[in-house]
């Protein structure tokens, strides 16, 4: 008789999760010479230890501490790009602008990007059937706590001018409940960060509105200003042209506003 298993509302652990994490770690450390000293088996052991045999609604940041420590790396603190609800463009940007980094350009972010995982209390099994959904089940689940932990540390490390890419097509361009709005904004260090510069990415080709005047952007400006960090905002009217101009900045069409 099969043992009763908790049914959660979210998708189960990504198939071949252990193999994927280990393979990503090996690939990352091969591509990034400064991370060659990292023992990927230890990284996997730390990752696994954070959620295996634990109730998937009772995960804490402390559970991820060994992984955070083993995966710590040097990222230029003045080259950090945060994003909210516009991951693909942010990643396309850092693939071209190689000296800038999103969280997913770091080892820990790269390992977990687009993956789901959870275990079960008191068994060493990984749950491939279902995992807790943040809204319907619980917020202290393995995936949510992981991203909260790495996002906090990433924001804490930032300095000078920090950039954030925001999706101008959404009803809430700045969403207080996003990881950026609930974690990263509050963990920028005012003694290190001088300015937060928002890039609002427009969706429609004919959209010429100044989305920097959007009420949610004003709300972001207020939160940032209260934290003694300066705020600036730029409209990116043509994201396709924006990327093209990052690739070829000397192109004559790149002097006009994008």
């Amino acid at each position: 008789v099969p043992r009763w298993r908790q049914q959660w509302s979210g998708p189960g652990t990504t198939k071949r999760f252990p193999e994927t994490v280990l393979a990503r770690c090996v690939k990352y450390t091969e591509i990034h010479p400064e991370m060659r000293h990292v023992d990927c088996q230890s990284v996997w052991d730390a990752f696994k230890g954070a959620f295996i045999s634990k109730h998937p609604c009772n995960i804490t940041e402390e559970d991820y501490q060994p992984l955070m420590k083993l995966g710590t790396q040097t990222v230029p603190c003045n080259k950090i790009l945060l994003w909210s609800r516009i991951k693909d463009l942010a990643h396309q940007f850092t693939q071209v602008q190689r000296d800038m980094f999103t969280l997913e350009d770091t080892l820990l972010g790269y390992l977990a990007d687009d993956l789901t995982w959870c275990g079960e209390f008191n068994t060493s099994k990984i749950n491939y059937q279902s995992c807790p959904d943040w809204r319907k089940d619980c917020s202290n689940n393995p995936v949510s706590v992981f991203w909260k932990t790495v996002s906090r540390r990433f924001a804490e490390a930032a300095c000078d001018v920090v950039h954030v890419m925001l999706n101008g097509s959404r009803s809430k361009i700045f969403d207080k409940n996003s990881t950026f709005g609930s974690v990263e904004v509050h963990n920028l260090q005012p003694e290190k960060v001088q300015t937060l510069e928002a890039w609002v990415i427009h969706g429609g080709r004919e959209d010429s509105r100044d989305l920097c005047q959007d009420p949610t952007i004003k709300e972001l400006e207020s939160i940032i200003s209260k934290r003694n960090i300066q705020f600036s905002c730029k409209n990116i009217y043509r994201p396709d042209k924006f990327l093209q101009c990052v690739k070829n900045p000397e192109d004559s069409s790149c002097t006009s506003e994008i």
Epitope: A46, G49, Q65, K69, T72, Q73, T74, A157
Partner: antibody
Framework: QVQLVQSGAEVKKPGSSVKVSCKAS????????IEWVRQAPGQGLEWMGD????????DYNEKFKGRVTITADESTSTAYMELSSLRSEDTAVYYC??????????WGQGTLVTVSS | DIQMTQSPSSLSASVGDRVTITCSAS??????LGWYQQKPGKAPKLLIY???NLHTGVPSRFSGSGSGTDFTLTISSLQPEDFATYYC?????????FGQGTKVEIK
Amino acid sequence: QVQLVQSGAEVKKPGSSVKVSCKASGYTFTNHWIEWVRQAPGQGLEWMGDIFPGGGYTDYNEKFKGRVTITADESTSTAYMELSSLRSEDTAVYYCARGRDLAMDYWGQGTLVTVSS
Amino acid sequence: DIQMTQSPSSLSASVGDRVTITCSASQNINVWLGWYQQKPGKAPKLLIYKASNLHTGVPSRFSGSGSGTDFTLTISSLQPEDFATYYCQQGQSYPYTFGQGTKVEIK
């Protein structure tokens, strides 16, 4: 080969501060955590805190929060541990060590700090 | 804080003896345990990391085992240079904590 060389012995008055240095060589300084551990005379080992020199990440033992500051100078591959508001029970040998797989693989020779009026 | 309890606190043994030291953690520390040897007036030296991995240059007579809460350091055949104090240390969570030490003395 990996080496951690610490500054010399210090005698300090109660209430003052001490700053111990730890110069690293033989590896990439910015890629590894530096741990600080102390040992009072005839006693066991006590972890104080650590730093990741490449990113400036620090973590401290709550017992020393507010009294200990750990810093690092990448240009000289040197880590520092400063302990303030010294009291007689801070008399100990202070060690730096390099972090490896959540253990400490290479240690400095130790710095004796004596707190006495 | 995670408490690390070593036993015994001291032991007397002869050259050639098999010696076992145990370390118990007050909560699950997975495999994040190190073992150190310290001689009087010297800095500790890492013997074993990640519960069972032998550190570079450490003789193979030293071995470690265990995971979760219970760990063991074994010296298969005690040598004269092995008389020292041995400490375990957990790296699972801050603050890192050490056992109180086990002194291995000559019988």
